[in-house]
Interface confidence: medium
Protein backbone atom coordinates (compact mmCIF):
# COMPACT_ATOMS: atom_id res chain seq x y z
CA UNK A 1 0.00 0.00 0.00
CA UNK A 2 0.70 3.70 -0.49
CA UNK A 3 2.50 5.48 2.75
CA UNK A 4 3.76 1.75 3.90
CA UNK A 5 7.26 0.44 4.24
CA UNK A 6 9.04 -0.01 0.36
CA UNK A 7 7.92 -3.72 -0.04
CA UNK A 8 9.79 -5.88 -1.70
CA UNK A 9 9.33 -6.62 -5.32
CA UNK A 10 7.48 -9.78 -6.01
CA UNK A 11 6.58 -11.26 -9.32
CA UNK A 12 4.08 -13.45 -9.78
CA UNK A 13 2.74 -16.22 -12.25
CA UNK A 14 -0.97 -17.33 -12.01
CA UNK A 15 -1.03 -21.18 -12.00
CA UNK A 16 -2.34 -22.55 -15.03
CA UNK A 17 -5.72 -23.80 -15.21
CA UNK A 18 -5.23 -26.10 -18.25
CA UNK A 19 -3.13 -26.22 -21.37
CA UNK A 20 -5.70 -24.55 -23.71
CA UNK A 21 -6.44 -20.61 -25.00
CA UNK A 22 -10.35 -21.12 -23.44
CA UNK A 23 -11.40 -18.90 -21.19
CA UNK A 24 -13.44 -20.46 -18.17
CA UNK A 25 -16.40 -19.06 -16.73
CA UNK A 26 -16.08 -17.75 -13.17
CA UNK A 27 -19.49 -16.66 -13.65
CA UNK A 28 -22.15 -18.89 -12.78
CA UNK A 29 -26.63 -18.24 -13.59
CA UNK A 30 -28.61 -18.08 -11.68
CA UNK A 31 -26.88 -17.16 -8.65
CA UNK A 32 -25.13 -19.16 -6.23
CA UNK A 33 -24.57 -17.72 -3.27
CA UNK A 34 -24.19 -18.88 0.57
CA UNK A 35 -26.79 -17.99 3.24
CA UNK A 36 -24.85 -15.23 5.03
CA UNK A 37 -21.74 -13.25 3.61
CA UNK A 38 -18.04 -14.15 4.55
CA UNK A 39 -16.48 -12.42 7.29
CA UNK A 40 -13.62 -9.96 5.68
CA UNK A 41 -10.00 -9.51 7.75
CA UNK A 42 -9.73 -6.27 9.00
CA UNK A 43 -9.92 -3.21 6.60
CA UNK A 44 -10.80 -5.69 3.42
CA UNK A 45 -14.08 -4.40 1.93
CA UNK A 46 -17.16 -6.41 1.94
CA UNK A 47 -18.31 -6.00 -1.76
CA UNK A 48 -20.59 -7.35 -4.45
CA UNK A 49 -18.66 -9.93 -6.63
CA UNK A 50 -17.93 -8.85 -10.65
CA UNK A 51 -20.72 -11.63 -11.55
CA UNK A 52 -23.14 -9.09 -9.47
CA UNK A 53 -24.10 -11.87 -7.40
CA UNK A 54 -23.05 -12.73 -3.68
CA UNK A 55 -21.02 -10.73 -1.45
CA UNK A 56 -17.65 -11.17 -1.12
CA UNK A 57 -14.15 -10.19 0.52
CA UNK A 58 -12.11 -7.64 -2.13
CA UNK A 59 -9.18 -9.30 -3.07
CA UNK A 60 -6.03 -7.11 -2.06
CA UNK A 61 -2.76 -5.86 -4.12
CA UNK A 62 -1.22 -8.71 -5.42
CA UNK A 63 -3.67 -11.79 -4.82
CA UNK A 64 -5.14 -13.00 -7.53
CA UNK A 65 -8.20 -11.85 -9.52
CA UNK A 66 -10.83 -13.30 -11.65
CA UNK A 67 -13.89 -11.23 -13.44
CA UNK A 68 -15.63 -12.54 -10.16
CA UNK A 69 -13.03 -11.95 -7.62
CA UNK A 70 -12.38 -8.66 -8.04
CA UNK A 71 -9.68 -6.12 -6.90
CA UNK A 72 -10.91 -3.82 -3.80
CA UNK A 73 -12.47 -0.57 -5.51
CA UNK A 74 -12.03 1.13 -2.12
CA UNK A 75 -8.25 0.87 -3.11
CA UNK A 76 -7.73 1.98 -6.44
CA UNK A 77 -6.72 -1.39 -7.41
CA UNK A 78 -7.17 -3.24 -10.71
CA UNK A 79 -6.91 -6.50 -11.95
CA UNK A 80 -3.98 -6.91 -14.42
CA UNK A 81 -4.11 -10.03 -16.60
CA UNK A 82 -0.73 -9.14 -18.15
CA UNK A 83 0.86 -12.21 -16.74
CA UNK A 84 -2.01 -14.59 -18.42
CA UNK A 85 -1.68 -14.11 -22.10
CA UNK A 86 -3.74 -15.17 -24.06
CA UNK A 87 -6.24 -15.74 -22.15
CA UNK A 88 -6.38 -13.15 -19.49
CA UNK A 89 -8.38 -15.13 -17.15
CA UNK A 90 -7.26 -15.20 -13.60
CA UNK A 91 -4.75 -11.79 -13.17
CA UNK A 92 -3.12 -9.81 -10.54
CA UNK A 93 -4.41 -7.13 -8.03
CA UNK A 94 -2.32 -4.03 -9.12
CA UNK A 95 -2.27 -0.13 -7.34
CA UNK A 96 -2.74 2.18 -10.14
CA UNK A 97 -0.30 5.08 -9.63
CA UNK A 98 -1.96 8.40 -8.62
CA UNK A 99 -5.94 6.56 -9.39
CA UNK A 100 -8.54 8.79 -9.14
CA UNK A 101 -11.45 8.78 -7.38
CA UNK A 102 -15.80 8.25 -7.67
CA UNK A 103 -18.21 9.30 -5.96
CA UNK A 104 -21.81 9.31 -6.71
CA UNK A 105 -20.82 8.35 -10.47
CA UNK A 106 -18.48 11.39 -11.01
CA UNK A 107 -14.93 10.70 -11.53
CA UNK A 108 -12.74 12.94 -9.70
CA UNK A 109 -8.62 13.31 -10.36
CA UNK A 110 -6.12 12.69 -8.10
CA UNK A 111 -5.28 14.98 -5.51
CA UNK A 112 -8.58 17.18 -6.29
CA UNK A 113 -10.62 18.80 -3.67
CA UNK A 114 -14.58 19.32 -4.60
CA UNK A 115 -17.41 19.92 -3.06
CA UNK A 116 -20.30 16.97 -3.79
CA UNK A 117 -22.86 19.93 -2.13
CA UNK A 118 -22.65 23.14 -0.32
CA UNK A 119 -22.47 21.27 2.69
CA UNK A 120 -18.91 19.09 2.49
CA UNK A 121 -15.88 19.69 1.27
CA UNK A 122 -13.77 16.28 -0.23
CA UNK A 123 -10.58 15.03 -1.07
CA UNK A 124 -9.63 12.55 -3.57
CA UNK A 125 -5.73 10.90 -2.78
CA UNK A 126 -5.30 7.83 -4.69
CA UNK A 127 -8.76 6.17 -4.83
CA UNK A 128 -9.50 7.29 -1.39
CA UNK A 129 -11.89 10.11 -0.75
CA UNK A 130 -11.99 12.61 2.61
CA UNK A 131 -14.67 14.66 3.81
CA UNK A 132 -14.87 17.19 5.98
CA UNK A 133 -18.26 19.13 6.96
CA UNK A 134 -18.25 22.54 5.99
CA UNK A 135 -21.27 23.62 8.25
CA UNK A 136 -19.65 24.04 11.68
CA UNK A 137 -22.39 23.78 14.02
CA UNK A 138 -22.33 20.14 15.41
CA UNK A 139 -24.12 21.38 19.21
CA UNK A 140 -27.37 23.90 20.12
CA UNK A 141 -25.57 26.78 20.82
CA UNK A 142 -26.93 28.14 23.69
CA UNK A 143 -26.38 25.34 26.91
CA UNK A 144 -29.21 26.24 28.78
CA UNK A 145 -31.62 25.36 25.84
CA UNK A 146 -33.36 22.42 26.45
CA UNK A 147 -35.45 22.02 23.10
CA UNK A 148 -33.19 22.90 20.25
CA UNK A 149 -33.88 22.08 16.58
CA UNK A 150 -32.01 22.02 13.51
CA UNK A 151 -34.18 24.70 11.11
CA UNK A 152 -33.16 24.69 7.10
CA UNK A 153 -33.01 28.60 6.55
CA UNK A 154 -33.94 29.96 2.96
CA UNK A 155 -31.32 31.05 0.65
CA UNK A 156 -28.80 29.33 3.53
CA UNK A 157 -26.65 26.10 2.99
CA UNK A 158 -25.99 25.46 6.61
CA UNK A 159 -28.70 24.48 8.86
CA UNK A 160 -29.09 27.09 11.99
CA UNK A 161 -29.99 25.95 15.62
CA UNK A 162 -33.43 27.20 16.97
CA UNK A 163 -34.07 27.06 20.37
CA UNK A 164 -37.85 26.76 21.50
CA UNK A 165 -37.81 26.42 25.05
CA UNK A 166 -37.49 30.44 26.03
CA UNK A 167 -37.21 33.10 23.17
CA UNK A 168 -37.04 35.35 26.25
CA UNK A 169 -33.63 34.12 27.50
CA UNK A 170 -31.03 36.74 28.05
CA UNK A 171 -28.59 36.55 25.51
CA UNK A 172 -25.25 36.36 28.06
CA UNK A 173 -24.04 32.58 27.57
CA UNK A 174 -21.79 32.94 24.27
CA UNK A 175 -18.81 32.55 26.38
CA UNK A 176 -19.95 30.06 28.01
CA UNK A 177 -20.76 28.05 24.82
CA UNK A 178 -17.51 29.05 23.38
CA UNK A 179 -15.80 26.89 25.97
CA UNK A 180 -18.02 24.32 25.77
CA UNK A 181 -17.08 23.86 21.70
CA UNK A 182 -13.42 24.87 22.66
CA UNK A 183 -13.54 21.36 25.41
CA UNK A 184 -14.73 19.11 22.54
CA UNK A 185 -11.70 19.04 20.92
CA UNK A 186 -11.82 21.87 18.78
CA UNK A 187 -8.86 24.76 19.06
CA UNK A 188 -9.99 28.35 19.77
CA UNK A 189 -7.85 31.29 19.81
CA UNK A 190 -9.06 34.86 19.57
CA UNK A 191 -7.73 37.16 16.91
CA UNK A 192 -9.03 40.71 16.32
CA UNK A 193 -12.39 40.43 14.21
CA UNK A 194 -12.22 36.91 13.87
CA UNK A 195 -12.61 33.65 16.18
CA UNK A 196 -9.98 31.01 14.80
CA UNK A 197 -11.68 27.83 14.60
CA UNK A 198 -10.17 24.35 14.18
CA UNK A 199 -11.73 21.26 13.91
CA UNK A 200 -10.47 17.94 15.28
CA UNK A 201 -9.39 15.77 12.66
CA UNK A 202 -11.85 13.43 11.36
CA UNK A 203 -11.39 9.59 11.96
CA UNK A 204 -9.13 7.55 9.12
CA UNK A 205 -10.84 6.88 5.89
CA UNK A 206 -9.70 3.67 6.00
CA UNK A 207 -8.84 1.02 8.48
CA UNK A 208 -5.68 -0.20 6.87
CA UNK A 209 -3.66 1.34 4.48
CA UNK A 210 -3.41 4.61 2.81
CA UNK A 211 -6.46 6.71 4.00
CA UNK A 212 -6.74 10.45 4.44
CA UNK A 213 -7.72 12.29 7.53
CA UNK A 214 -9.53 16.18 7.02
CA UNK A 215 -10.10 19.15 9.32
CA UNK A 216 -11.24 22.66 8.52
CA UNK A 217 -9.43 25.50 10.06
CA UNK A 218 -9.89 29.28 9.20
CA UNK A 219 -6.48 30.05 10.84
CA UNK A 220 -5.42 32.07 8.14
CA UNK A 221 -4.72 35.48 6.77
CA UNK A 222 -8.29 35.77 5.40
CA UNK A 223 -9.79 33.69 8.36
CA UNK A 224 -11.83 31.92 5.69
CA UNK A 225 -12.61 27.95 6.46
CA UNK A 226 -10.32 25.98 4.57
CA UNK A 227 -10.00 22.42 4.32
CA UNK A 228 -6.57 20.45 5.57
CA UNK A 229 -5.75 17.26 4.88
CA UNK A 230 -2.92 14.82 5.92
CA UNK A 231 -2.87 10.90 5.39
CA UNK A 232 -3.09 8.48 7.65
CA UNK A 233 -2.14 4.45 8.14
CA UNK A 234 -3.56 3.17 11.25
CA UNK A 235 -2.44 -0.08 10.05
CA UNK A 236 -0.69 -2.29 7.20
CA UNK A 237 -3.13 -4.06 5.43
CA UNK A 238 -0.55 -6.76 4.59
CA UNK A 239 0.67 -7.67 7.83
CA UNK A 240 -1.43 -10.35 10.11
CA UNK A 241 -1.15 -8.50 13.01
CA UNK A 242 -3.41 -11.11 14.87
CA UNK A 243 0.14 -13.36 14.44
CA UNK A 244 1.74 -11.25 16.92
CA UNK A 245 -1.10 -11.30 19.83
CA UNK A 246 0.71 -13.31 22.76
CA UNK A 247 -0.70 -16.12 24.00
CA UNK A 248 -3.67 -15.77 26.58
CA UNK A 249 -3.78 -12.06 24.92
CA UNK A 250 -6.84 -10.92 23.15
CA UNK A 251 -5.16 -7.44 21.63
CA UNK A 252 -1.72 -5.66 20.55
CA UNK A 253 -2.18 -2.31 21.11
CA UNK A 254 0.41 -1.26 18.80
CA UNK A 255 2.55 -3.38 16.12
CA UNK A 256 5.89 -1.69 14.79
CA UNK A 257 8.14 -2.86 12.45
CA UNK A 258 11.84 -4.41 13.38
CA UNK A 259 13.20 -1.63 10.92
CA UNK A 260 13.20 1.36 10.21
CA UNK A 261 11.97 2.13 6.13
CA UNK A 262 11.44 4.88 3.75
CA UNK A 263 7.57 5.99 3.20
CA UNK A 264 6.47 5.58 -0.41
CA UNK A 265 3.45 7.31 -2.07
CA UNK A 266 2.83 7.82 -6.17
CA UNK A 267 6.54 6.04 -6.62
CA UNK A 268 8.33 8.73 -4.59
CA UNK A 269 10.18 7.69 -1.67
CA UNK A 270 10.42 9.93 2.07
CA UNK A 271 13.72 11.66 2.33
CA UNK A 272 14.52 9.32 5.36
CA UNK A 273 13.34 6.52 7.19
CA UNK A 274 10.91 5.93 9.52
CA UNK A 275 9.31 3.42 12.07
CA UNK A 276 5.74 4.16 12.50
CA UNK A 277 3.80 2.42 15.22
CA UNK A 278 0.78 1.23 13.61
CA UNK A 279 -2.82 0.52 16.24
CA UNK A 280 -3.04 -3.58 15.92
CA UNK A 281 -6.33 -5.46 16.24
CA UNK A 282 -8.60 -7.56 18.79
CA UNK A 283 -9.36 -11.04 18.88
CA UNK A 284 -12.78 -9.96 20.07
CA UNK A 285 -15.09 -7.26 18.75
CA UNK A 286 -13.13 -4.29 20.11
CA UNK A 287 -11.68 -1.90 18.23
CA UNK A 288 -7.99 0.05 18.29
CA UNK A 289 -7.37 3.47 17.50
CA UNK A 290 -4.55 6.17 18.02
CA UNK A 291 -5.01 7.56 21.47
CA UNK A 292 -1.55 9.72 21.42
CA UNK A 293 -0.99 11.33 17.85
CA UNK A 294 0.55 14.08 16.24
CA UNK A 295 0.59 15.40 12.58
CA UNK A 296 3.89 15.25 11.04
CA UNK A 297 5.56 16.60 7.61
CA UNK A 298 7.27 14.40 5.58
CA UNK A 299 8.90 15.00 2.22
CA UNK A 300 9.37 13.39 -0.79
CA UNK A 301 11.63 12.64 -3.70
CA UNK A 302 10.70 11.67 -7.15
CA UNK A 303 12.68 9.61 -9.36
CA UNK A 304 11.45 12.62 -12.06
CA UNK A 305 10.99 15.86 -11.18
CA UNK A 306 10.36 17.97 -7.91
CA UNK A 307 9.47 16.32 -4.99
CA UNK A 308 7.34 17.35 -2.18
CA UNK A 309 5.87 17.50 1.02
CA UNK A 310 2.37 15.71 2.70
CA UNK A 311 1.23 16.34 5.83
CA UNK A 312 0.67 12.45 7.78
CA UNK A 313 -0.93 11.41 10.78
CA UNK A 314 1.92 9.96 13.32
CA UNK A 315 0.76 7.94 15.95
CA UNK A 316 2.39 7.50 19.58
CA UNK A 317 0.09 4.94 21.23
CA UNK A 318 -3.09 3.45 20.62
CA UNK A 319 -5.52 1.90 22.52
CA UNK A 320 -7.95 -0.80 22.30
CA UNK A 321 -11.85 -0.03 24.00
CA UNK A 322 -13.97 0.55 21.65
CA UNK A 323 -16.55 -1.75 19.72
CA UNK A 324 -15.73 -2.37 16.06
CA UNK A 325 -19.50 -1.51 14.81
CA UNK A 326 -18.47 -2.70 10.80
CA UNK A 327 -15.31 -3.33 10.51
CA UNK A 328 -15.41 -3.79 6.73
CA UNK A 329 -17.06 -0.51 6.07
CA UNK A 330 -14.02 1.43 5.81
CA UNK A 331 -16.69 4.64 5.55
CA UNK A 332 -18.21 3.59 9.18
CA UNK A 333 -16.39 6.16 10.71
CA UNK A 334 -18.32 8.59 8.55
CA UNK A 335 -21.78 7.65 10.05
CA UNK A 336 -20.82 9.85 13.36
CA UNK A 337 -21.03 12.42 11.16
CA UNK A 338 -23.98 14.95 10.73
CA UNK A 339 -25.52 14.52 7.45
CA UNK A 340 -23.48 11.62 6.35
CA UNK A 341 -25.90 10.56 4.12
CA UNK A 342 -25.37 13.69 2.26
CA UNK A 343 -21.91 11.84 1.11
CA UNK A 344 -22.61 8.50 0.99
CA UNK A 345 -26.24 9.01 -1.24
CA UNK B 1 16.85 29.85 25.69
CA UNK B 2 14.02 26.95 25.87
CA UNK B 3 12.51 27.16 29.51
CA UNK B 4 9.22 25.77 31.44
CA UNK B 5 8.75 27.95 34.70
CA UNK B 6 5.69 26.89 37.04
CA UNK B 7 3.69 28.45 39.54
CA UNK B 8 4.67 28.76 43.40
CA UNK B 9 4.01 26.26 46.13
CA UNK B 10 0.88 25.84 47.19
CA UNK B 11 -0.79 24.49 51.10
CA UNK B 12 -4.21 22.55 50.26
CA UNK B 13 -6.91 21.24 52.29
CA UNK B 14 -8.45 17.86 51.78
CA UNK B 15 -10.90 17.77 49.04
CA UNK B 16 -9.62 21.04 47.87
CA UNK B 17 -8.49 21.23 44.30
CA UNK B 18 -4.86 22.19 42.83
CA UNK B 19 -4.14 23.96 39.67
CA UNK B 20 -0.77 24.00 38.68
CA UNK B 21 0.64 26.26 35.72
CA UNK B 22 3.69 25.71 33.15
CA UNK B 23 5.04 28.48 31.42
CA UNK B 24 6.48 27.43 28.11
CA UNK B 25 9.05 30.06 26.41
CA UNK B 26 12.16 29.31 24.22
CA UNK B 27 10.73 27.41 21.80
CA UNK B 28 7.14 26.64 20.03
CA UNK B 29 4.56 25.76 22.63
CA UNK B 30 2.64 23.81 20.28
CA UNK B 31 5.13 21.94 18.74
CA UNK B 32 5.70 19.50 21.81
CA UNK B 33 3.82 17.87 24.20
CA UNK B 34 3.14 18.66 28.00
CA UNK B 35 3.67 15.56 30.41
CA UNK B 36 2.90 16.02 34.58
CA UNK B 37 4.85 14.29 36.61
CA UNK B 38 5.46 14.02 40.57
CA UNK B 39 7.18 13.12 43.46
CA UNK B 40 6.07 12.45 46.72
CA UNK B 41 8.73 12.78 49.29
CA UNK B 42 11.06 9.44 49.65
CA UNK B 43 8.94 8.42 46.20
CA UNK B 44 10.13 8.05 42.44
CA UNK B 45 9.18 10.09 39.94
CA UNK B 46 5.34 9.30 38.96
CA UNK B 47 3.87 10.31 35.17
CA UNK B 48 0.23 11.96 35.67
CA UNK B 49 -0.32 12.69 32.00
CA UNK B 50 0.17 14.47 28.49
CA UNK B 51 -1.55 17.17 26.77
CA UNK B 52 -1.20 18.35 22.85
CA UNK B 53 -1.10 21.56 23.19
CA UNK B 54 -1.96 21.99 19.55
CA UNK B 55 -5.19 20.34 19.43
CA UNK B 56 -5.95 20.48 23.70
CA UNK B 57 -6.03 16.49 23.21
CA UNK B 58 -4.74 14.54 26.85
CA UNK B 59 -4.34 11.17 28.61
CA UNK B 60 -3.73 10.49 32.21
CA UNK B 61 -2.51 7.43 33.16
CA UNK B 62 -5.14 5.45 35.18
CA UNK B 63 -4.16 6.20 38.80
CA UNK B 64 -5.45 10.06 37.70
CA UNK B 65 -8.00 9.13 35.38
CA UNK B 66 -11.15 11.61 36.45
CA UNK B 67 -9.31 13.70 38.76
CA UNK B 68 -6.55 15.35 36.60
CA UNK B 69 -7.48 18.16 33.68
CA UNK B 70 -4.94 19.44 31.78
CA UNK B 71 -5.31 22.09 29.92
CA UNK B 72 -3.59 25.26 28.03
CA UNK B 73 -3.60 28.77 26.87
CA UNK B 74 -1.71 28.84 23.78
CA UNK B 75 -2.12 32.52 23.27
CA UNK B 76 0.37 32.79 26.63
CA UNK B 77 2.38 29.67 25.60
CA UNK B 78 1.22 27.89 29.45
CA UNK B 79 -0.24 24.62 30.17
CA UNK B 80 -2.39 23.88 33.49
CA UNK B 81 -2.59 21.29 35.57
CA UNK B 82 -5.21 20.71 37.85
CA UNK B 83 -5.75 17.58 40.62
CA UNK B 84 -9.02 17.73 42.38
CA UNK B 85 -9.78 15.13 45.33
CA UNK B 86 -6.71 16.45 46.80
CA UNK B 87 -5.40 13.85 50.09
CA UNK B 88 -2.80 13.87 52.24
CA UNK B 89 -1.19 11.19 49.72
CA UNK B 90 -0.82 13.85 47.26
CA UNK B 91 1.55 16.10 49.05
CA UNK B 92 4.35 16.17 46.28
CA UNK B 93 6.54 18.24 43.78
CA UNK B 94 4.80 18.45 40.73
CA UNK B 95 6.75 18.60 37.57
CA UNK B 96 6.02 19.68 33.97
CA UNK B 97 8.37 18.70 31.05
CA UNK B 98 7.88 18.79 27.08
CA UNK B 99 9.03 16.17 24.86
CA UNK B 100 8.89 15.48 21.03
CA UNK B 101 7.23 12.40 21.36
CA UNK B 102 7.78 11.79 17.33
CA UNK B 103 11.28 11.68 17.96
CA UNK B 104 11.63 9.79 20.68
CA UNK B 105 13.81 12.33 22.59
CA UNK B 106 12.01 11.77 25.99
CA UNK B 107 11.35 14.82 28.56
CA UNK B 108 14.38 17.05 27.34
CA UNK B 109 13.00 20.28 29.62
CA UNK B 110 11.44 20.25 32.78
CA UNK B 111 10.17 23.26 34.74
CA UNK B 112 11.63 23.86 38.42
CA UNK B 113 8.26 22.23 40.24
CA UNK B 114 5.83 23.42 42.13
CA UNK B 115 5.37 21.98 45.91
CA UNK B 116 2.01 21.13 46.47
CA UNK B 117 1.22 20.01 50.43
CA UNK B 118 -2.14 18.74 51.46
CA UNK B 119 -2.63 19.36 55.12
CA UNK B 120 -5.67 19.82 57.50
CA UNK C 1 3.67 0.31 41.92
CA UNK C 2 6.81 0.96 39.23
CA UNK C 3 6.36 -1.95 36.31
CA UNK C 4 10.56 -0.89 35.68
CA UNK C 5 12.68 -2.50 37.62
CA UNK C 6 16.01 -0.96 39.18
CA UNK C 7 18.30 -2.07 42.21
CA UNK C 8 17.64 0.39 45.17
CA UNK C 9 21.40 1.78 45.49
CA UNK C 10 24.74 1.41 43.70
CA UNK C 11 28.21 2.78 44.09
CA UNK C 12 32.08 3.56 43.04
CA UNK C 13 34.75 5.25 43.83
CA UNK C 14 35.86 8.11 41.58
CA UNK C 15 37.21 6.86 38.36
CA UNK C 16 35.16 3.83 38.35
CA UNK C 17 32.76 2.37 36.10
CA UNK C 18 29.23 1.90 37.64
CA UNK C 19 26.49 0.01 35.93
CA UNK C 20 22.58 0.73 36.61
CA UNK C 21 20.23 -1.70 35.04
CA UNK C 22 16.66 -1.56 34.25
CA UNK C 23 13.98 -4.46 33.50
CA UNK C 24 10.92 -4.49 32.17
CA UNK C 25 8.97 -6.54 30.43
CA UNK C 26 7.95 -6.88 26.47
CA UNK C 27 5.52 -3.85 26.59
CA UNK C 28 7.66 -1.16 27.22
CA UNK C 29 11.40 -1.67 27.34
CA UNK C 30 10.96 -4.55 24.55
CA UNK C 31 8.92 -2.48 22.75
CA UNK C 32 9.83 0.86 23.20
CA UNK C 33 13.05 3.11 23.38
CA UNK C 34 14.21 3.83 27.17
CA UNK C 35 14.75 6.94 28.49
CA UNK C 36 17.55 7.46 31.24
CA UNK C 37 17.38 10.72 33.93
CA UNK C 38 19.40 11.81 36.85
CA UNK C 39 17.92 13.71 39.45
CA UNK C 40 19.61 15.38 42.17
CA UNK C 41 17.70 16.53 45.77
CA UNK C 42 16.09 20.11 45.32
CA UNK C 43 16.34 20.71 41.37
CA UNK C 44 14.10 19.05 38.43
CA UNK C 45 15.46 16.07 37.12
CA UNK C 46 17.65 15.53 34.03
CA UNK C 47 17.56 14.00 30.49
CA UNK C 48 21.07 11.73 30.36
CA UNK C 49 20.05 9.11 27.62
CA UNK C 50 17.50 8.67 25.02
CA UNK C 51 16.28 6.52 22.56
CA UNK C 52 18.21 3.66 24.51
CA UNK C 53 21.45 5.07 23.65
CA UNK C 54 21.38 8.99 22.54
CA UNK C 55 22.78 11.65 24.40
CA UNK C 56 21.18 15.09 24.51
CA UNK C 57 23.90 17.64 23.88
CA UNK C 58 25.26 18.73 27.29
CA UNK C 59 26.12 15.23 28.53
CA UNK C 60 29.65 13.92 28.24
CA UNK C 61 30.19 11.04 26.66
CA UNK C 62 31.23 9.52 30.25
CA UNK C 63 27.32 8.28 30.39
CA UNK C 64 26.25 5.74 27.80
CA UNK C 65 22.89 3.96 27.47
CA UNK C 66 22.38 0.17 25.90
CA UNK C 67 19.28 -1.77 25.59
CA UNK C 68 18.56 -5.54 25.19
CA UNK C 69 15.31 -7.39 24.93
CA UNK C 70 13.49 -6.23 28.44
CA UNK C 71 16.50 -4.94 29.71
CA UNK C 72 18.42 -1.71 29.53
CA UNK C 73 21.21 -0.54 31.38
CA UNK C 74 23.10 2.82 31.99
CA UNK C 75 26.78 3.21 32.62
CA UNK C 76 28.73 5.80 34.14
CA UNK C 77 32.38 5.63 33.26
CA UNK C 78 34.86 7.98 34.89
CA UNK C 79 32.94 8.33 37.94
CA UNK C 80 33.29 11.47 39.45
CA UNK C 81 31.45 12.95 42.56
CA UNK C 82 29.42 15.17 40.71
CA UNK C 83 27.45 11.88 39.56
CA UNK C 84 25.86 10.89 42.87
CA UNK C 85 22.23 11.06 42.38
CA UNK C 86 19.30 9.21 41.68
CA UNK C 87 19.08 7.91 38.58
CA UNK C 88 15.43 6.77 36.43
CA UNK C 89 14.86 4.50 33.68
CA UNK C 90 11.65 5.27 31.61
CA UNK C 91 10.21 3.95 28.83
CA UNK C 92 6.76 4.11 27.27
CA UNK C 93 4.12 0.93 27.51
CA UNK C 94 1.59 -0.08 25.20
CA UNK C 95 -0.33 -1.97 27.17
CA UNK C 96 -1.06 0.65 29.94
CA UNK C 97 -0.79 3.69 28.18
CA UNK C 98 1.38 5.56 30.45
CA UNK C 99 5.05 6.45 30.49
CA UNK C 100 6.23 4.28 33.18
CA UNK C 101 9.54 5.28 35.45
CA UNK C 102 11.67 2.81 36.82
CA UNK C 103 12.26 2.47 40.95
CA UNK C 104 14.99 4.91 40.94
CA UNK C 105 18.45 3.73 41.60
CA UNK C 106 20.75 6.11 44.12
CA UNK C 107 23.80 5.82 43.05
CA UNK C 108 26.94 7.09 46.00
CA UNK C 109 30.44 8.02 45.04
CA UNK C 110 32.36 6.70 47.71
Known amino acids: TALSPTPTTMTFTPAPLEETTTRPEFCKWPCECPQSPPRCPLGVSLITDGCECCKICAQQLGDNCTEAAICDPHRGLYCDYSGDRPRYAIGVCAQVVGVGCVLDGVRYTNGESFQPNCRYNCTCIDGTVGCTPLCLSPRPPRLWCRQPRHVRVPGQCCEQWVCDDDARRPRQTALLDTRAFAASGAVEQRYENCIAYTSPWSPCSTTCGLGISTRISNVNARCWPEQESRLCNLRPCDVDIQLHIKAGKKCLAVYQPEEATNFTLAGCVSTRTYRPKYCGVCTDNRCCIPYKSKTISVDFQCPEGPGFSRQVLWINACFCNLSCRNPNDIFADLESYPDFEEIAN | QMQLVQSGAEVKRPGASVKVSCKAS????????INWVRQATGQGLEWMGW????????GSAPAFQGRVTMTRDTSIGTAYMELSGLTSEDTAVYYC?????????????WGQGTLVTVSS | QSVLTQPPSASGTPGQTVTVSCSGR????????VDWYQHLPGTAPKLLIY???RRPSGVPDRFSGSKSGTSASLAISGLQSEDEADYYC???????????FGTGTKLTVL
Open chain 3, 51 to 53: SSN
Open chain 2, 97 to 109: ARDDFYDSSGFDA
Open chain 3, 90 to 100: AAWDDSLNVYV
Open chain 2, 26 to 33: GYSFTNFD
Open chain 2, 51 to 58: MDPNSGNS
Open chain 3, 26 to 33: SSNVGSNT
